[in-house]
């Protein structure tokens, strides 16, 4: 999700921005801090068995508008945000999870508490 | 033009504390973080840390952790770096450097020198 | 942490002739966003290190045609076609791949 205001194409930054990452470290990260020229990110989606999983991360500038977008994906719970506006900014990200379809109840597995 | 300003020299006792500034002018100072080298007389280039002037977020050289520590003045584009229980061996030059994916412009440097 | 190493240590090379130093680091520069963040500096006595090339091949603003750079992942070269006597320097590799970000030792360029 993007500030209201911000251009949809890509502006390089003049200036590198770090990011805190979680289960999404490059091997250029140090002490799970990236790098990039992009943005940060921070992920929630459903793993194989329907727990939540969160990723946080760096996204280079090339596709990262496309990824930040958060466009829906069929038969996949999965929300992303990005931001630039700090260093580790994404450590302030906490994406939820879409609620669920009617139709996803109906498709996917059962999950019991 | 870019221009980072930094004292010619400092003297300072062994054991003792300095604030070395470097003034930039030229550009948007929050636009670029800003970086410290070491240069020890005839010898080569050793990377200090960076600071980010628009969120003062810092990294450091584990080398240097507890040694130098990096801080901003915004209000007047200045960057700071304050080196803490002198020895000879923190006698040196050091230059503060414009980063934004590499050091584009470099200060004159300030030459410290540590002695009694 | 990243080694950079330069060779030769030091290079003597008469007028109008080509110098090449090489640099070699100890893991691959290439950064996860896809661009290799090496670059070289030229330092004279008395003075600040200046940017010649940055992230391998792109010449600063204001800097000569003959300086040139190229390579790759872990071995990046730096060559200066026609040696002029203002080229008189030591000239740095670094990286800012990794932190913490590391040069070169160094090497001396000299007119023979």
């Known amino acids: 999700k993007k500030e209201d205001g911000e251009s949809t194409a890509p502006t390089p930054r003049p200036k590198v921005l770090r990011c805190k990452c979680h289960h999404h470290c490059p091997e250029d990260s140090v002490n799970n801090i990236c790098s990039t020229d992009g943005y940060c990110f921070t992920m929630i989606e459903e793993d194989d068995s329907g727990l939540p999983v969160v990723t946080s991360g760096c996204l280079g500038l090339e596709g990262s508008d496309f990824q930040c977008r958060d466009t829906p994906i069929p038969h996949q719970r999965r929300s992303i945000e990005c931001c630039t506006e700090r260093n580790e900014c994404n450590k302030d990200l906490h994406p939820t999870l879409p609620p669920l379809k009617n139709r996803d109840f109906v498709d996917g597995p059962i999950h019991h508490r | 033009q870019v221009q980072l300003q930094q004292p010619g020299a400092e003297l300072v006792k062994p054991g003792a504390s300095v604030k070395l500034s470097c003034k930039a002018s030229?550009?948007?100072?929050?636009?670029?973080?800003m970086q410290w080298v070491k240069q020890r007389p005839g010898q080569g280039l050793e990377w200090i840390g960076e600071i980010d002037p628009s969120d003062q977020y810092t990294l450091y050289n584990q080398k240097f952790k507890g040694k130098a520590t990096l801080t901003v003045d915004t209000s007047s584009s200045t960057a700071y770096m304050q080196l803490s229980s002198l020895t000879s061996e923190d006698s040196a030059v050091y230059y503060c450097?414009?980063?934004?994916?590499?050091?584009?412009?470099w200060g004159l440097g300030t030459t410290l020198t540590v002695s009694s | 942490d990243i080694v950079m190493t330069q060779s030769p240590d030091s290079l003597a090379v008469s007028l109008g002739e080509r110098a090449t130093i090489n640099c070699r680091s100890s893991?691959?520069?290439?950064?996860?966003?896809?661009?290799?963040?090496l670059h070289w500096y030229q330092q004279k006595p008395g003075q600040p290190p200046k940017l010649l090339i940055y992230?391998?091949?792109n010449r600063f603003s204001g800097v000569p045609d003959r300086f040139s750079g190229s390579g790759s992942g872990t071995d990046f070269t730096l060559t200066i076609s026609s040696l002029q006597a203002e080229d008189v320097a030591v000239y740095y590799c670094?990286?800012?791949?990794?932190?913490?970000?590391?040069f070169g030792q160094g090497t001396k360029l000299e007119i023979k």
């Open positions: 992230k391998v091949s």
């Open positions: 450097a414009r980063f934004g994916y590499y050091v584009d412009y």
């Open positions: 670094s990286q800012s791949t990794h932190v913490p970000f590391t």
């Open positions: 030229g550009y948007t100072f929050t636009s670029y973080w």
């Open positions: 893991q691959s520069l290439v950064h996860s966003t896809g661009n290799t963040y």
